[in-house]
């Protein structure tokens, strides 16, 4: 079941998943000057069964000048924001990721892919946050968010992370320096 909205935005932080649950969509987005091919998929889909999962469909980009019913316009000016979704940096692959049943690995990049990946997550997905370069992480608890189904509605738990403007970066799980977390795992459940 798809999550109704996106994971929470944390100022000066980005998030990523270590693996993607079956049913996850990854939009086929192309970099500026390119677009999905006319007969190209809208998204890639993590599909399969408990023993083997893989990405269905392939994203393909072509020059946007090649099709007369596609236009490229200059977007309205807006404030520059930190990217909140997975950026195309070198993806970090935990060694055990492939062995997670019902999950897909980070898909390899496709030619002329956009710099930012847009995922549609499913219930049960967990994402991990890290501060962007130049910001330091202050943890009150886990720097993660989980999409949960509560009373027929989906929602993301609130990650316990604050990024402060000090020149030190925090890493994703597996590369993180141990930090004291005196409080227990914070409950961000909401009653209804």
């Amino acid at each position: 079941e798809l999550c109704d909205d996106d994971p929470p935005e944390i100022p000066h932080a980005t998030f990523k998943a270590m693996a993607y649950k079956e049913g996850t969509m990854l939009n086929c987005e192309c970099k500026r000057g390119f677009r999905r091919i006319k007969s190209g998929s809208l998204y890639m889909l993590c599909t399969g069964n408990s023993s083997h999962s893989s990405w269905d469909n392939q994203c393909q980009c072509t020059s946007s000048a090649t099709r007369n019913t596609t236009k490229q316009v200059t977007p309205q000016p807006e404030e520059q924001k930190e990217r909140k979704t997975t950026e195309m940096q070198s993806p970090m692959q935990p060694v055990d990721q492939a062995s997670l049943p019902g999950h897909c690995r980070e898909p390899p990049p496709w030619e002329n892919e956009a710099t930012e990946r847009i995922y549609h997550f499913v219930v049960g997905q967990m994402v991990y946050y890290q501060c962007v370069q130049g910001y330091r992480a202050l943890h009150r608890g886990p720097a993660e968010s989980v999409c949960k189904m509560t009373h027929g509605k989906t929602r993301w738990t609130q990650p316990q992370l604050i990024c402060t403007g000090e020149m030190e970066t925090s890493q994703f799980p597996g590369e993180e320096k141990p930090q004291a977390s005196p409080e227990g795992r914070p409950e961000s459940e909401t009653s209804c």
């Epitope: 996106d6 500026r32 190209g40 469909n57 596609t70 236009k71 909140k84 979704t85 956009a114």
Partner: antibody, heavy 114, light 107 residues
Framework: QVQLQQPGAELVRPGTSVKMSCKAA????????IGWVKQRPGHGLEWIGD????????NYNEKFTGKATLTADTSSSTAYMQLSSLTSEDSAIYYC???????WGQGTLVTVSA | DIQMTQSQKFMSTSVGDRVSVTCKAS??????VAWYQQKPGQSPKALIY???YRYSGVPDRFTGSGSGTDFTLTISNVQSEDLAEYFC?????????FGGGTKLEIK
């Protein structure tokens, strides 16, 4: 929660144009395509086109090229569709959709009448 | 353009029954098919994506199946609130196209 707000109705004269809005809330507007769908009784649903507010791309169904013009304003998280040279054939409900068709607006009923 | 054909415009069923709404694509669309439910006076609601995956909040009595050119939306244990029109849609190739709709009537 994701919401797409559209005005309920527009009454317009033949030969004129109309510009309808779709205000998005509850998600990052610039990340997702916004599409437009036409519904007329007996004609089912027709996809008009879509726009990527962040990337600035627009795709049109060739049937609506010259009829519909799609724009988006990221500062107000609002998408717009302008329909020109209106005739009775343009009387319909127009829906905006987003997040891979997961979310639909309530629709704007356009009535073209003298 | 790819045509999506829902051959049955109307289907009649009873509460508790199982009903299957079918949709045929004019060419192979893989599993790039969605199903929508539209109740009278309301906007369409997304039920199924990628032929067989349910959106959140959609009861599990709604099941999608098929690939290639033939697709089915099955409603098991039909409830009175399922009275609606059901549309299929392909998003395999521009322009995205919809089926003509199947109206489900409850006896």
């Amino acid at each position: 929660q994701v919401q797409l707000q559209q005005p309920g109705a527009e009454l317009v004269r033949p030969g004129t144009s109309v510009k309808m809005s779709c205000k998005a809330a509850g998600y990052t507007f610039s990340n997702y395509w916004i599409g437009w769908v036409k519904q007329r009784p007996g004609h089912g649903l027709e996809w008009i086109g879509d726009i990527h507010p962040g990337g600035g791309y627009i795709n049109y169904n060739e049937k609506f090229t010259g009829k519909a013009t799609l724009t988006a304003d990221t500062s107000s998280s609002t998408a717009y569709m302008q329909l020109s040279s209106l005739t009775s054939e343009d009387s319909a409900i127009y829906y905006c959709v987003s997040r891979n068709f997961a979310n639909w607006g309530q629709g704007t009923l356009v009535t073209v009448s003298a | 353009d790819i045509q999506m054909t829902q051959s049955q415009k109307f289907m009649s069923t009873s509460v508790g029954d199982r009903v299957s709404v079918t949709c045929k694509a004019s060419q192979n669309v893989g599993t790039n098919v969605a199903w929508y439910q539209q109740k009278p006076g309301q906007s369409p609601k997304a039920l199924i994506y990628s032929a067989s995956y349910r959106y959140s909040g959609v009861p599990d009595r709604f099941t999608g199946s098929g690939s290639g050119t033939d697709f089915t939306l099955t409603i098991s244990n039909v409830q009175s609130e399922d009275l609606a029109e059901y549309f299929c849609q392909q998003y395999n190739s521009y322009p995205w196209t919809f089926g003509g709709g199947t109206k489900l009537e409850i006896k």
